[in-house]
Each structure stands twice: as structure tokens, then as C-alpha cells.
Interface confidence: low
């Protein structure tokens, strides 16, 4: 009968040897066998599992010149880089007729200093602010134990006392380097060394002193920044859409921001240069050397109106026996809110200044006193929105009116006999 | 095997500053453990005074931290003690060690009698 | 700083014997106290780390035991090279601190 065909007689005249070596070795199992008849496949397991996709080599050398002669058959399976999934008990594996040969087994090991599975991660955080750290290392050997240091001193004794996979770190006031040391019986691992930058908190109540038109002087309460003092703070201002979309939380307003620094102390900005009575949002982040804070969610503010800077424009007054038509331009100046009409002043060289509230018109034919025959008669104009009247208008002297010029039609305004209330002319 | 050698001056005068170097060979001072000079003085009293770590941050006695500062060369696989403004009182034999990573020193140099004298 | 007494500071034996040194730390260092063999014309020895642990390749007649602040060496079946100079160390913080020294004598 052709050898190894019998159950009690293997055909395995070698069986694979043991490894045991770190992480990244390269190394070889090999089994031999002699077989009467064509070759068989020599397949591997580990830990009795078929190796579908193992790296081995099949070398078959015939003992004499017949093919139903014996052969010595080699196979040789090659470990490149030894990882932890590659341990186990390997076995060659041959089906010859219809029996199955199992080799007896060789062992794989994974024997060195520790492995990093996670190591601490650079970050930054706000000063006295509690954070965690990670770090996880593995065997073989086991156990494995972590040791914390920070700024290259120990936070515990020895490794396996103090925190293991996750260090808890209750705030620091500077910034520090994190890295932890994994032991075995083969020796020490250290992690990379990470380092934690220390910010400045974020600013806490962020709010208006006062209001101006044009600007806006704004407050705030800076945060810790451990032993770095803060250099400067920074406050930017957007014009807030109709939406308001700019919300706690949402990303950043699509605009570019207006910018400002701020010296500090104190902590407090004149932020100028703005629109009236516009809707703005603002926040402030602080720096220190480390780096600045995390801004403050948006405020949102408002500058308050404020009277026109220039007079109405083009004024016209023209006269025709007892009425005088009066028309006149929205001032080209800018409003600064929302105009909310105009007011009219005229008086003659010897009678009491007259004055009017026109609202909104920017056209008036008033009905003057006695027979017309008043002289040197001038009208001024001056804008007002909800903050008060913007400047008046130079006198405009009353012309006559002559034929053919256009007069539109219009609402007469007929003035009482005592004046309701009298500015002074200036 | 892991050696430490001490050398430096025998006598050093008051008020000066004593300069002491630790040559290690067998292991890389930047690789793993702290370095340590620890002295002995007579009547055999030990005293620890410092180490570099090898990432090249330093730990010293309190007793000792405004005179005192560990260096290195890592080129060389040298570290460094300076302590300024000797006195009498620190005529003693200087060693210096390497920290086991359970943090006691598995290694230590002969030693180096330093007196401080006039 | 943590203060460590060792006592005796001086011991007369002889080969063959078992003897005990002692040290006491002013406060609690856990188990960290190491032992040191210190002989003329040889580097310092590092016997035991962390109360009990033995150093490699040092001579299992060497022990160590106590925590918290009483800490015993042992060494049983004096060997005439044992008779030396030992010290303690605590290493449990810093500044690491040592025991007095023990001087081991042949009786």
C-alpha cells in the first residue's frame, strides 16, 4: 500500500517549529513529509482553520526515476510581519487517498515591548478646563501596564497605578506635554508626546455700555488663561441679515465680519464706523501668547437712529398774492433712520416766525396772512426722523410767482392766526 | 551592559560653580529612563538631587533648585550636573544613575569625590 | 519631604544567619521603597523595587516586604559577600529620599 495511505502512519517526517518574536519579525514554518505517488497539496491551518490566502511555497523532489516512486515533499509558509492575528498553532494539512494527515503542530508567539493602539492627540483647551487624554497598549507579554507623565514627570509611581486608558485631567493653567510609558517584562514604550495648549476661556457677558448712531461701545468678562495673560481681544460685528439667521451655534455669517482689537485692560471696545439704526451681530474671542479663545455666541445689538446729517435739497418757494408754494427734495445727506417727515419755518422781516409740520410731502402752498403784502417773506426746511430734526435749510426768500410758470395743484394749508408753537430764527 | 562613568574636578573652590559629567555607554541617554546625579557625603548621608528625563525635561530637589542644573549632550550620551555657589557643605562623592521603569535606579557610576575647599 | 529612618545603622552577623533591617517612612509611600547594596570599589546595587519586587539577577536569599511606612529587608543564609553597606530609598514621590545606611559586619 502507498505510504501514508494507513491512518496510523503519517507521512510527516518534519513538522513546523515555534516562533515567538516582536511585532514586525519575519520568520518561516516548514513541514516535510515523504509520500509513494503523485504529490499531494500540502495546505496550512492555524488553530484548525484552512489559511485560504497563505504565503508558502510547495517544493517536491522525487526519490527515484518511477513517479509511483517516493517523494519528499516541503512546504514552506512564510510569516512577514508578525502581527498579533498571526499567533496561534499552525498545522500542515494533506489528503491522500481518501484519508486526511494533520502535522503536529508548531506554535506562533507574539513576544515584545508593548504596542500602541492609542496615543494621546495634541489639542488645545481653555484654562482650568477638565479634558481627558487616551492611551491603550498591548502585549504580548501581559499584563501591560500605563504610566501617565506629564511634562515628562510621573503622575503616578509606578505603572499600574494611577489612571490606565483614559487620564482624567481636571484643568490646566499652562500648557503641558501629555505622554504615557506602556510596561512589560520586555521593557518600556513611550506613546509620542502630545501637548496640550492652554486658552484663554471663552469671554463671558458680552454687552452693550452704550449706543451712538455710528457706534457702539461694548463691555465684556474676560475668562482665565492660567499664567498667560491675555494680549489682546478681538471683537468683530456683522450686519445681521432680515432672517436673522445667525444663531447660537450656526456657522459663521456669510458677510466678512468688521474687526477690532481691543487692548486690554479694560475690557471694552468703542466699536465706530457703523450704520444707524442697523441691526448688527457681535462677538469676542480674548488671546494670550498660547492662542485665543473660542468666540462668544453672536449678540445681537442694534445702533440707535439718528437725525439727518444734511438739510432737504432744492428748495423752491414762490408766491402768488396770498399763497406760496413751497417744494423741496429729500436731503441727499444720509437719513440715519427712517424719515418720519419735514418740518417748515417762515417768517417776514417784521413778523413772527411761523413753523409747520409738513409730514411726509416734500411739496406746501400756505395761506398767508392779511393781503400778501408782508415782506422779505423766507422759508427753511429741515428733515426729522424719531431722533430729531436734522439741520435746517439756508432762508430761501420768497419769489413771485410769474404767468405761465407751472403751479401744481395742491392742498392748501391754512395757517392759524397765533402760531401753534415758535422757534426762534437762526 | 549598561556603564555610567562620573568625572570632573576633585577640588573646587568656595563660590564656584561645580561642574560634574556623567558619560553613559550601553543605552541611549534619549531612548528611555531618567538620569539622576545623587551625592553622598561623609558620614554617608545620600541626598538625590535631580534627574534629566530623556525626553530632556528636567526634576530637581527643591533643596537644591536655585544652584542647581542637569544638561545633556546627546550626541556625545552625556548628561550634566552644574551646581553654583559651592560650599564646604558640599564636599561629598557625586554619582549618577539611570531610573528602572518602576523608578528606582538599577544603574549607578562609581562616584566622584568632589571637595569644596580654599 | 518624606523622612526615612533605617535602623539598625550598624549589624554584626554571621555567614549562614538571617538578619533584618528596617526602614520607616515619615508618611505613607504605598510599596514604593527600594534597597540599595552599596560595597567599596563597586557600583551600587539595586537589590529590591517597590517593597518586594527583586531585581534581576540578585540572589533569591534577598526579600523584601511592608508598605504604607514599615519596610523589612531580609537576608537569609548570610553569604560572606553580603557583608556591605544597605540603604532604602523611597520612591514613591519627589525628591526621592534615602535611609541613614546600615554598615553589615562579620560578628
Known amino acids: 500500500a502507498p505510504r501514508g495511505t494507513q491512518a496510523e502512519e503519517s507521512p510527516f517526517v518534519g513538522n513546523p517549529g515555534n516562533i515567538t518574536g516582536a511585532r514586525g519579525l519575519t520568520g518561516t514554518l516548514r513541514c516535510q513529509l515523504q509520500v509513494q505517488g503523485e504529490p499531494p497539496e500540502v495546505h496550512w491551518l492555524r488553530d484548525g482553520q484552512i489559511l485560504e490566502l497563505a504565503d508558502s511555497t510547495q517544493t517536491q523532489v522525487p526519490l527515484g526515476e518511477d513517479e509511483q516512486d517516493d517523494w519528499i515533499v516541503v512546504s514552506q509558509l512564510r510569516i512577514t510581519s508578525l502581527q498579533l492575528s498571526d499567533t496561534g498553532q499552525y498545522q500542515c494539512l494533506v489528503f491522500l487517498g481518501h484519508q486526511t494527515f494533520v502535522s503536529q503542530p508548531g506554535y506562533v508567539g507574539l513576544e515584545g515591548l508593548p504596542y500602541f493602539l492609542e496615543e494621546p492627540e495634541d489639542r488645545t483647551v481653555a484654562a482650568n478646563t477638565p479634558f481627558n487624554l487616551s492611551c491603550q497598549a498591548q502585549g504580548p507579554p501581559e499584563p501591560v501596564d500605563l504610566l501617565w507623565l506629564q511634562d515628562a514627570v510621573p503622575l503616578a509611581t509606578a505603572p499600574g497605578h494611577g489612571p490606565q486608558r483614559s487620564l482624567h485631567v481636571p484643568g490646566l493653567n499652562k500648557t503641558s506635554s501629555f505622554s504615557c510609558e506602556a510596561h512589560n517584562a520586555k521593557g518600556v514604550t513611550t506613546s509620542r508626546t502630545a501637548t496640550i495648549t492652554v486658552l484663554p476661556q471663552q469671554p463671558r457677558n458680552l454687552h452693550l455700555v452704550s449706543r451712538q448712531p455710528t457706534e457702539l461701545e461694548v463691555a465684556w468678562t474676560p475668562g482665565l488663561s492660567g499664567i498667560y495673560p491675555l494680549t489682546h481681544c478681538t471683537l468683530q460685528a456683522v450686519l445681521s441679515d432680515d432672517g436673522m439667521g445667525i444663531q447660537a451655534g450656526e456657522p459663521d455669517p456669510p458677510e466678512e465680519p468688521l474687526t477690532s482689537q481691543a487692548s486690554v485692560p479694560p475690557h471694552q471696545l468703542r466699536l465706530g464706523s457703523l450704520h444707524p439704526h442697523t441691526p448688527y451681530h457681535i462677538r469676542v474671542a480674548c488671546t494670550s501668547s498660547q492662542g485665543p479663545s473660542s468666540w462668544t455666541h453672536w449678540l445681537p445689538v442694534e445702533t440707535p437712529e439718528g437725525v439727518p446729517l444734511g438739510p432737504p435739497e432744492n428748495i423752491s418757494a414762490t408766491r402768488n398774492g396770498s399763497q406760496a408754494f413751497v417744494h423741496w427734495q429729500e436731503p441727499r445727506a444720509p437719513l440715519q433712520g427712517t424719515l418720519l417727515g419735514y418740518r417748515l419755518a417762515y417768517q417776514g422781516q417784521d413778523t413772527p416766525e411761523v413753523l409747520m409740520d409738513i409730514g411726509l410731502r416734500q411739496e406746501v402752498t400756505l395761506e398767508l396772512q392779511g393781503d400778501g403784502s408782508v415782506s422779505n417773506l423766507t422759508v427753511c426746511v429741515a428733515a426729522y426722523t424719531a431722533a430729531g430734526d436734522g439741520p435746517w435749510s439756508l432762508p430761501v426768500p420768497l419769489e413771485a410767482w410769474r404767468p405761465g410758470q407751472a403751479q401744481p395743484v395742491h392742498q392748501l394749508v391754512k395757517e392759524p392766526s397765533t402760531p401753534a408753537f415758535s422757534w426762534p430764527w437762526w | 551592559d549598561v556603564q555610567l562613568q562620573e568625572s570632573g574636578p576633585d577640588l573646587v573652590k568656595p563660590s564656584q560653580s561645580l561642574s560634574l559629567t556623567c558619560t553613559v555607554t550601553g543605552y541611549s541617554i534619549t531612548s528611555a529612563y531618567s538620569w539622576h546625579w545623587i551625592r553622598q557625603f561623609p558620614g554617608n548621608k545620600l541626598e538625590w538631587m535631580g534627574y534629566i528625563h530623556y525626553s530632556g525635561s528636567t526634576n530637581y530637589n527643591p533643596s537644591l533648585k536655585s544652584r542647581i542644573s542637569i544638561t545633556r549632550d546627546t550626541s556625545k550620551n552625556q548628561f550634566f550636573l552644574q551646581l553654583s555657589s559651592v560650599t564646604t557643605e558640599d564636599t561629598a562623592t557625586y554619582y549618577c544613575?539611570?531610573?528602572?521603569?518602576?523608578?528606582?535606579?538599577?544603574?549607578w557610576g562609581q562616584g566622584t569625590s568632589v571637595t569644596v575647599s580654599s | 519631604d518624606v523622612q526615612i529612618t533605617q535602623s539598625p545603622s550598624y549589624l554584626a552577623a554571621s555567614p549562614g544567619e538571617t538578619i533584618t533591617i528596617k526602614c520607616r517612612a515619615s508618611?505613607?509611600?504605598?510599596?514604593?521603597l527600594a534597597w540599595y547594596q552599596e560595597k567599596p570599589g563597586k557600583t551600587n546595587k539595586l537589590l529590591i523595587y517597590s517593597g518586594s519586587t527583586l531585581h534581576s539577577g540578585i540572589p533569591s536569599r534577598f526579600s523584601g516586604s511592608g508598605s504604607g511606612t514599615d519596610f523589612t529587608l531580609t537576608i537569609s543564609s548570610l553569604e560572606p559577600e553580603d557583608f556591605a553597606m544597605y540603604y532604602c530609598?523611597?520612591?514613591?514621590?519627589?525628591?526621592?529620599?534615602f535611609g541613614g545606611g546600615t554598615k553589615l559586619e562579620i560578628k
Open positions: 530609598q523611597q520612591h514613591n514621590e519627589y525628591p526621592w529620599t
Open positions: 544613575a539611570r531610573s528602572l521603569w518602576f523608578y528606582a535606579m538599577d544603574y
Open positions: 508618611k505613607s509611600i504605598s510599596k514604593y
